[in-house]
């Protein structure tokens, strides 16, 4: 069966300066390949987090991505600013040269409230 990417929340609201968790779970780890978070869609989308060795300030994984039984690819964004507003997508890729996008979550819109 094809892997499904589940983003349970359609939207979240967070006060500027606070932290928020964007939830994403997969139904399978197969096929082999990375999971990445983007803000926006199309050519202009911005890479927010990749479950690899890359380092992303203010963004951390919520659960242990190296754990073999782990299907939770949620992220935490800390010290949220108004510029963080937008729709975030959890995207599953199949490993290759280059990697191929095979499934995306439905997106979670982040609203940033003035503190």
């Amino acid at each position: 069966t094809e892997v499904k990417v589940i983003q349970p929340e359609k939207s979240v609201s967070v006060a500027a300066g606070d932290s928020t968790v964007l939830n994403c779970t997969l139904t399978s780890l197969l096929p082999v390949g990375p999971i990445r978070w983007y803000r926006g869609v199309g050519q202009s989308r911005q890479l927010i987090y990749s479950f690899t060795t890359e380092h992303f300030p203010r963004v951390t994984n919520v659960s242990d991505a190296t754990k073999r039984s782990n299907l939770d690819f949620s992220i935490r964004i800390s010290n949220v600013t108004p510029e963080d507003a937008g729709t975030y997508y959890c995207v599953k890729f199949q490993r290759g040269s280059p990697d191929t996008e095979i499934q995306s979550g439905g997106g979670t819109e982040v609203y940033v409230l003035a503190k």
Partner: antibody, heavy 124, light 106 residues
Framework: AVTLDESGGGLQTPGGALSLVCKGS????????MNWVRQAPGKGLEWVAG????????YYGAAVQGRATISRDNGQSTVRLQLNNLRAEDTATYYC?????????????????WGHGTEVIVSS | ALTQPASVSANPGETVEITCSGG?????YGWFQQKSPGSAPLTVI????KRPSDIPSRFSGSKSDSTGTLTITRVQAEDEAVYYC??????????FGAGTTLTVLG
């Protein structure tokens, strides 16, 4: 060569606490998940606890859940197991193990190296 | 716990297979040799089929469906030991098999 040296075993009192330390060398300690495994006299192997390479995530076996704390200091290349409220059934040889570049704490399929072990006897 | 046979036996030079089942759906199997009670185990296979550098090529591992297999070709007397498989269950907890005693006959 990879070496894992455990210390802190010995005779312990029921209800007391113990602290085991494992010192790793010969590999990039901060890149590998670590586990503690024990073996009671005449019994098989039992997983005790595990910790991810960065120390953010910890995992515990059912027999020690709520009594154990695993932690690591990547600067010192050490992993520590604290076990409280000791019972006679905690009597065992405790082994420190290293994961070989895959998996995390609890993923025993990834263990590629073992320490020599430290013996713990819980008795009054 | 993982399921593995209690004992297997083989003559020197023969091939022996030890199976292990019960690991989580996403997990692999590792194989650990213990030559005597109280002596430190030795990893002979990890991550299904990877072999530490000091382990002879006579030891190999594989996984088919949810069953892991340790294969020892050209068995030698020094291979006599208890072999444990290890993995993790679907909750992520580490699990071992009860151990398989390999007896080398003759």
């Amino acid at each position: 060569a990879v070496t894992l040296d455990e210390s802190g075993g010995g005779l312990q009192t029921p209800g007391g606490a113990l602290s085991l330390v494992c010192k790793g060398s010969g590999f990039t300690f901060s890149s590998h998940a670590m586990n503690w495994v024990r073996q009671a006299p005449g019994k098989g192997l039992e997983w005790v606890a595990g910790i991810s390479s960065d120390g953010r995530f910890t995992y515990y076996g059912a027999a020690v859940q709520g009594r154990a704390t695993i932690s690591r200091d990547n600067g010192q290349s050490t992993v520590r197991l604290q076990l409280n409220n000791l019972r006679a059934e905690d009597t065992a040889t405790y082994y420190c193990t290293k994961n070989g570049g895959c998996g995390s704490g609890g993923d025993l399929d990834c263990i590629d190296a073992w320490g020599h072990g430290t013996e713990v006897i819980v008795s009054s | 716990a993982l399921t593995q046979p209690a004992s297997v036996s083989a003559n020197p030079g023969e091939t022996v297979e030890i199976t292990c089942s019960g690991g989580g759906s996403n997990n692999a199997y590792g194989w650990f040799q213990q030559k005597s009670p109280g002596s430190a185990p030795l990893t002979v296979i990890y991550d299904n089929g990877k072999r530490p550098s000091d382990i002879p090529s006579r030891f190999s591992g594989s996984k088919s469906d949810s069953t892991g297999t340790l294969t020892i070709t050209r068995v030698q007397a020094e291979d006599e030991a208890v072999y444990y498989c290890g993995s993790a269950d679907n909750s992520g907890a580490g699990v071992f098999g009860a151990g398989t005693t390999l007896t080398v006959l003759g």
